[in-house]
């Protein structure tokens, strides 16, 4: 665990990026599935 003020904000940024990456992967997968089903 970090007490650092630089690391604190960077950790939040990393989490946001991870969520965006995950959502992009999930949505991308769904889109590909829809195209395939058509």
């Amino acid at each position: 665990h970090s007490d650092g003020i630089f690391t604190d904000s960077y950790s939040r940024y990393r989490k946001q990026m991870a969520v965006k990456k995950y959502l992009a992967a999930v949505l991308g997968k769904r889109y590909k599935q829809r195209v395939k089903n058509k």
Partner: antibody, heavy 113, light 110 residues
Amino acid sequence: VEESGGRLVTPGTPLTLTCTVSGFSLSSYAMIWVRQAPGKGLEWIGIIYDNGDTYYASWAKGRFTISKTSTTVYLKIASPTTEDTATYFCAREPGSTTQNDLWGQGTLVTVSS
Amino acid sequence: DVVMTQTPASVSEPVGGTVTIKCQASENIYNSLLWYQQKPGQPPKLLIYRASTLASGVSSRFKGSGSGTEFTLTISDLECADAATYYCQNYYNIWTNGAAFGGGTEVVVK
């Protein structure tokens, strides 16, 4: 926090500065490198985060490389010029509850032919 | 990178007086600002973080204020020991904005 490795080098000779830390973990804190030319102000060079990610000032990209091991942070100056003559400081980021940071005394790099 | 502009470059005030140092960011950095004091031959010492929070062991004569792009460091009841150079530093989204220092303000105590 203690810097070492500063010395007189000729232009173009690569140089690596060392920052040795104790009393805290580099896996919990970010470290920054800052330099100060004689009689001039502070200049931020770059940062290495707890996870090893590095970011640099625009002017420092390609000229400097920051890396680390478990107890040591490094600053490599790829091809020093006379403008790189300065005291180089290594510092731990401020803590939000400890309310302090940690700076070394600096190490002097002189680039001259 | 965000550019930090500090004014004045130098200021001289008598013991017991008040000094005001301004720091301007080239874009919004919210409250992500540090203030340092540096004396000759020494590394910087952290005075204030988050623009207005006093660091551990720092005298309450030092006061930081501001947010966004305009920040101020006020030193009241000046003492001889306050003679030093003061710097502001941005730390908002370092990964995109960098963490530049202001140019510094030399405080001379008469």
